[in-house]
Each structure stands twice: as C-alpha cells, then as structure tokens.
C-alpha cells in the first residue's frame, strides 16, 4: 500500500537567463528511495539520481543542469523554451513509484518574481 505523498515547489516563475531550483519531497512513507528521475515537459529525461551510484546528467543538459540541493535539480541559464511542466519520479521500495509535477514559467521581465511555495499536487 502506497502511503507516501510528494510535495513539490508547485507553480514557479523565474527570470530568463537566471536559474531556478526544482524540488520534490517524499513524505509519510518509510519506503527506501532507490532512484529519482527528473523529466521535462516533452518527456525527455534531464537527470537521474541513483541511490547507489549518484547523479547522471543527460548530455544535452550537462551545461545547464546542476544536481541538488538534495534530490532536487537546479536549472540554469533559463530560456523561454524552458517554460512548461517538470516531473519528479521517485522509485521506491517497497512502495513503488511516486510522481510529482512542477510548472515553471520563464518570464522576460527583469522583475520576474521567483515563487517557491511547497504544495501537494
């Protein structure tokens, strides 16, 4: 039985050229996290954090994605094309798979506010 819940940074906005932290947090379960996948709106994988071997950043994102903090991901040098949905997928044992959603809006404005509230989708 899956008792856990994924908390995410929800809907966030950030400035073009800037950076943003994508963060998910798994709570209310004692399951062991074996792997966390970070996926972009077009379903392309950005990065994977494996419990045994660490972070793998996909080559296409190597220069713009930094691991962490924690199991989160930092997107750098943001472009307008980065606007869209991002998904964290927690592979756990024995529970199975948990998935969280974040919507990122990249703004042209130099006064773009970066909101980062935690919410349960």
């Amino acid at each position: 039985m899956m008792t856990g819940t994924i908390e995410t940074t929800g809907n966030i906005s950030a400035k073009k050229g800037g950076s943003v932290i994508l963060q998910c947090h798994l709570s209310s379960t004692m399951a062991q996290v074996t792997q966390v996948n970070w996926e972009q709106h077009d379903h392309s994988l950005l990065a994977i954090r494996n419990a045994e071997l660490g972070w793998h950043i996909y080559p296409a994102f190597k220069d713009r994605v930094a691991p962490g903090p924690g199991l989160g991901l930092t997107l750098q040098s943001l472009t307008m094309n980065d606007t869209g949905e991002y998904f964290c997928t927690y592979h756990t044992y024995p529970d199975g798979t948990y998935r969280g959603r974040i919507f990122l809006e990249v703004l042209e404005s130099s006064v773009a506010e970066h909101s980062a509230r935690f919410q349960i989708p």
């Epitope: 792997q35 996948n37 994988l45 994977i48 494996n50 045994e52 071997l53 660490g54 972070w55 793998h56 950043i57 996909y58 190597k62 930094a66 691991p67 997928t89 592979h91």
Partner: antibody, heavy 128, light 107 residues
Framework: EVQLVESGGGLVQPGGSLRLSCAAS????????MDWVRQAPGKGLEWVGR??????????EYAASVKGRFTISRDDSKNSLYLQMNSLKTEDTAVYYC???????????????????WGQGTTVTVSS | EIVLTQSPGTLSLSPGERATLSCRAS???????LAWYQQKPGQAPRLLIY???SRATGIPDRFSGSGSGTDFTLTISRLEPEDFAVYYC????????FGGGTKVEIK
C-alpha cells in the same frame, strides 16, 4: 586514442607509503567516474575504490580492506587520478590498475556501470 | 556485500567447442550492473559484456551474456585460440565486487 597510464609503483616496507598516478588521455576526464582495481600475484581482481565525477562532487568510495589507509583523489585540470597508500601491509602487494568507470543511462531509466578502459597496471610490492 | 561465485574454477576445452561460464550472486543484482571481463596473462582486464547481455565495442559476436537476478552466464559459442584466458564477472554493489574468475584452458 583513449588511454590510461599508471605510474608510481615500487618496493616499499610494511607501514610505508606510496602514491600511484594514472594519466588519462583521449576523453573528457571530468565527466567520468574513475576506479582503482588491484590484483595480488596469482589471485583475482579486487576493487579498491572510486572517485565520482564533477557532477557528483568528486565523492569517493573504498573497499573495506583499504578504508582509512588509502585515499583516492583526482585533478581534472591535469587529467590525472591518484591513489595515496599509507600504512601499507604485505597483503597490499599487487598490480594496481586504474580504470574508467562508465556510468550512464540510456533513453530509458535503466542505468549501467562498467569499466571500459583500463591502464596497463603498476606493481606495488610491500616487503621488508 | 554481494558475493559473486564463478563456476567452474577451470574449464578445459578444445578450440571450436562451446564454453559456458556461470556467475552466481549471493543476492539479487540489477542486470544492468553486471559485467564480464577477459584477462590474459600479463595483461590488463578487457571489458567483454556490460548490462549482463550487451557486447562491448569490438567484441566478436561469439561472446554472449545472459541471466538476471542471481544467475548470470557468459557463453563463448566457438572457442578461438585467443579466447583461452581468465574470465571475471563484476557487479556494482556497493561495494563493487568481482567473482573469483574462471580459467578457460586448452584441453
């Protein structure tokens, strides 16, 4: 050409120290995990430890048999890997190999890890 | 620590024969983290198979790997003179461990 060349082996007394080096060429060194593996005379392969890549903050892991005595480090600017061996014991006598760790994921989330490039080895003899 | 047990310790065969090498793990291993290496006297190990069944670059198709969970197999369909060597399986762990090796010798 992708290549690894070890150096620094030799004869050392029990309790002594030795530093091995591994010079890498032909690939982007900073992207890769790097492992040390040893082989005692007439015996099988034994993993010594590894250093992860820049994306993983160069964290290190060690086999229980060397933990606390051996230290792995790297200098990406010199494409070099090192193994500092302290408090050496006679059972550390072996050929020491450095190897490139290939850690990656394909289009699926199926991860792979293996050592695809090996150096020729350097011999360490611990004897009084 | 996951212990890998290879059998047999020595395999005596003639060129042209089929070689079947076994690697058994003390607990389940992800197949994508299982590799096989070949080592000849005085040489460094050479990667043959990764991910339990994928051949490394430049490895002839007479070499094949299979298995999952705790039981893995390396098969050499027709032994060539250059295939007589010691073969090791390896898993990631942690810690990373090798099997004790199987020596394939000329009968």
């Amino acid at each position: 050409e992708v290549q690894l060349v070890e150096s620094g082996g030799g004869l050392v007394q029990p309790g002594g120290s030795l530093r091995l080096s591994c010079a890498a060429s032909g690939f982007t060194f900073s992207d890769h995990y790097m492992d040390w593996v040893r082989q005692a005379p007439g015996k099988g392969l034994e993993w010594v430890g590894r250093t992860r890549n820049k994306a993983n903050s160069y964290t290190t892991e060690y086999a229980a048999s060397v933990k606390g005595r051996f230290t792995i480090s790297r200098d990406d600017s010199k494409n070099s890997l090192y193994l500092q061996m302290n408090s050496l014991k006679t059972e550390d006598t072996a050929v020491y190999y450095c190897a490139r760790g290939q850690y990656y994921y394909g289009s699926s989330s199926r991860g792979y890890y293996y050592m695809d490039v090996w150096g020729q080895g350097t011999t360490v003899t611990v004897s009084s | 620590e996951i212990v890998l047990t290879q059998s047999p310790g020595t395999l005596s065969l003639s060129p042209g024969e089929r070689a079947t090498l076994s690697c058994r793990a003390s607990q389940s291993v992800r197949s994508s983290y299982l590799a096989w290496y070949q080592q000849k006297p005085g040489q460094a190990p050479r990667l043959l198979i990764y991910g339990a069944s994928s051949r490394a670059t430049g490895i002839p198709d007479r070499f094949s790997g299979s298995g999952s969970g705790t039981d893995f197999t390396l098969t050499i369909s027709r032994l060539e003179p250059e295939d007589f060597a010691v073969y090791y399986c390896q898993q990631v762990g942690p810690p990373l461990t090798f099997g004790g090796g199987t020596k394939v010798e000329i009968k």
